[in-house]
């Protein structure tokens, strides 16, 4: 779509005569008829295929034609066309004398024609005017012409429609050739796709306006390049969404089970050595002089009853000192000045002489000990109960009262709540300090995996076109991460399918 514009500049008819040579009375009141048509090697009469236009009376005999475009007038003359400009044309300009006010062809006598010019040639679309002058024996016409595109039409032949736009169907202006020039921040064939924040992850991020980065499900961060771990993941990370890969020393579905209590809590005191012995379980090996589950208790050196033969022990800064009873001597009162003749054995002990009567030894009945059978046996002095068990004297024997989670004569065995296989449907059992926990397979839940739930949403391979499937364990649904060029909840559709219509 465009306009052929013809600007009449000057018409000279000095003698004021018609084409027949007859003079006009009182002068030639001149108007013009213009015919624009397709290119003809020899311009001939016939339909004005590109259009016609007529002027009012512009002057008498000889006159200059005023440029009237600014005032909405008729110069230049406009010949609009609604087709692709072919680049060639034929133009006929006729000057007529108007004896009266009726300028219609049928109202004029045939001999009212003053002059007729016909030209043809090539004409490219452009802003520049082509100046021309046609002279006959009696008249001269000076004019210029050009072809320009109508508003919103572009290109060499005004065939490209383009309307600048700045809404959600496009953000662009039009180039001289009719191609779109996207406004800053927009891209795509129709400039309707925003350019996301620089670095925004191509698959995991998107945007609805320029310089934005919105994350798809399972991703986070300014550039949507950080996966979101499973909801409730405590001491773990992910490499794909909804994972929970445990940090070192942690276990369980949510990485909240402490497998390295020693490092994380340092429970052993006074320089004791800590050993992990299971989930939230540990053993402290005390340095000499300390006792207790966490080696938190300082031992008195007299607690081991080092003084024999009834000697009494006294703590000292650098150790201890034994006060021996009469008849005994030595660091631990271990040497006797007595013999069997002195009846040194108490509580029914039998005396046996040694070293030719210079010394003796007492053989003690059950429940008594000491070099003179003077001490009742305390079976707990050797701290025989492991894992913090409490030692209890029970007459001739002893027993260990174990802490929760331990059993055995000496509390040396770790109780496994998992031994009875409490987790149903193939659930994995984990011992806890005060009980157990079941990690259920896909499709089961509940404290003992006894409740049947939905199966792994990704198990049926719902994603197409080599898309990656992620199971959102919190909602039992899947998310397909599409490869480039595919869209849809299952990545089943290639991007940019050509439109089709219902007819």
């Amino acid at each position: 779509s465009g306009v052929f514009q013809l600007q009449l500049q000057e018409f000279i008819n000095e003698r004021g005569v018609l084409a027949s040579g007859r003079p006009c009375e009182p002068g030639c009141r001149t108007f013009f008829r213009v015919c624009l048509k397709h290119f003809q090697a020899v311009v001939s009469p016939g339909p004005c295929t590109f259009g016609t236009v007529s002027t009012p009376v512009l002057g008498t005999n000889s006159f200059a034609v005023r440029d009237d475009s600014s005032g909405g007038g008729r110069n230049p003359l406009q010949l609009p066309f609604n087709f692709t400009w072919p680049g060639t044309f034929s133009l006929i300009i006729e000057a007529w004398h108007a004896p009266g006010d009726d300028l219609r062809p049928e109202a004029l006598p045939p001999d009212a024609l003053i002059s007729k010019i016909a030209i043809q040639g090539s004409l490219a679309v452009g802003q520049n005017w082509l100046l021309d002058e046609q002279t006959s024996t009696l008249t001269r016409l000076r004019y210029s012409y050009r072809v320009i595109c109508s508003d919103n039409y572009y290109g060499d032949n005004c065939s490209r429609l383009c309307k600048k736009r700045n809404d959600h169907f496009g953000h662009y202006v039009c180039q001289p050739d009719g191609n779109l020039s996207c406004l800053p921040g927009w891209t795509g064939e129709y400039c309707q796709q925003p350019i996301c924040l620089s670095g925004c992850h191509e698959q995991n991020g998107y945007c609805s306006k320029p310089a934005e980065c919105l994350c798809r499900p399972g991703w986070q961060g300014r550039l949507c390049n950080e996966c979101i771990p499973h909801n409730g993941c405590r001491h773990g990370t992910c490499s794909t969404p909804w994972q929970c890969t445990c940090d070192e020393g942690w276990g369980g579905l949510f990485c909240d089970q402490d497998l390295n209590y020693c490092t994380h809590h340092s429970p052993c005191k006074n320089g004791a050595t800590c050993s992990n012995s299971g989930q939230r379980s540990y053993t402290c090996t005390c340095r000499p002089g300390y006792t207790g589950v966490d080696c938190e208790l300082e031992l008195s050196e007299c607690d081991s009853n080092p003084c024999r033969n009834g000697g009494s022990c006294k703590d000292q800064e650098d150790g201890y000192h034994c006060l021996c009873p009469p008849g005994y001597y030595g660091l631990h009162c271990e040497h006797s000045t007595l013999s069997c003749a002195d009846s040194p054995c108490f509580n029914g002990g039998s005396c046996r002489e040694r070293n030719q009567g210079a010394n003796y030894a007492c053989e003690c009945p059950p429940n008594f000990t000491g070099s003179n059978c003077e001490k009742k046996v305390d079976r707990c002095t050797s701290n025989p109960c492991a894992n913090g068990g409490q030692c209890l004297n029970r007459g001739p024997s002893r027993m260990c009262r174990c802490r929760p989670g331990f059993t055995g004569t000496y509390c040396e065995l770790h109780v496994s709540d998992c031994a009875r296989n409490p987790c149903a449907h193939g659930g994995t059992c984990h011992d806890l300090e005060n009980g157990l926990m079941c990690t259920c397979p896909a499709g089961f839940s509940g404290r003992r995996c006894e409740v049947r739930t939905s199966i792994d949403a990704c198990a049926s391979s719902p994603c197409f076109n080599r898309a990656t499937c992620y199971t959102d364990l919190s909602t039992d649904t899947f998310v397909c991460n599409c490869p480039y060029g595919f869209v849809g909840s299952r990545c089943e559709f290639p991007v940019g399918l050509p439109p089709s219509f219902p007819w």
């Epitope: 309307k163 169907f169 129709y190 796709q193 849809g488 940019g496 439109p499």
Partner: antibody, heavy 121, light 106 residues
């Protein structure tokens, strides 16, 4: 061939919220070439554009209805939805969902068959 | 708000040309679509981008748009063309429909 199907209650009480869903079949709602719109037509009257949505969730609303309209999209179900709050009898109309094509400069080439929603107590 | 004005009705004899106008401020600078709607049916797109016809739409439907007026022309009108016709354009981010024109084939 692309098909659109509106669904939702045909009767809503005044001051309540009108809720409709449009299910798209035969094509993906996640295509970058389309917006998905809602248009309504009161009985015996002309068409009125309500608003539209892109698959990313970007929405555009008619200013005259903006305070009451919410349009959302669920790409996993290939659906988009309309909610119109505080309805009155003037909201009684046939509600259409349609596909607006970027390539067609916003022309709507596919329409649902329409669903009549009556607002009455 | 932006408005598009259409004549309420246009009558045409079979085989004649029907012209429906749609007026709006600088409408020529916007892309216009035209829809045909028959009673009890959904609208059908007959013209987009001022003058383009979707596949399946007969050649007798044509469109133009310049200045403040867009025109839908049905040449050689047939009885089956009797329907309501709506023009539509986009103003900023808002879709705007014309008031509609009822075409009656006499």
């Amino acid at each position: 061939e692309v098909q659109l199907q509106e669904s939702g209650p045909g009767l809503v009480k005044p001051s309540e919220t009108l809720s409709l869903t449009c299910t798209v079949s035969g094509g993906s709602i996640s295509s970058s070439s389309y917006y998905w719109g809602w248009i309504r037509q009161p009985p015996g009257k002309g068409l009125e554009w309500i608003g539209d949505i892109y698959y990313t969730g970007s929405t555009y609303y008619n200013p005259s209805l903006k305070s009451r309209v919410t349009i959302s999209v669920d790409t996993s179900k290939n659906q988009f939805s309309l909610k119109l709050s505080s309805v009155t009898a003037a909201d009684t109309a046939v509600y259409y969902c349609a596909r607006e094509d970027v390539i067609l400069r916003g022309g709507s080439d596919y329409w649902g068959q329409g669903t009549l929603v009556t607002v009455s107590s | 708000s932006y408005e598009l004005t259409q004549p309420p009705s246009v009558s045409v004899s079979p085989g004649q040309t029907a012209s429906i106008t749609c007026s709006g401020d600088t409408l020529g600078d916007k892309y216009v679509s035209w829809y045909q709607q028959k009673p009890g049916q959904s609208p059908v797109l007959v013209i987009y981008e001022d003058s383009e016809r979707p596949s399946g739409i007969p050649e007798r439907f044509s469109g133009s748009n310049s200045g403040d007026t867009a025109t839908l022309t049905i040449s050689g009108t047939q009885p089956m063309d009797e329907a309501d016709y709506y023009c539509q354009a986009w103003d900023s981010e808002t879709g705007v429909f014309g008031s509609g024109t009822k075409v009656t084939v006499l």
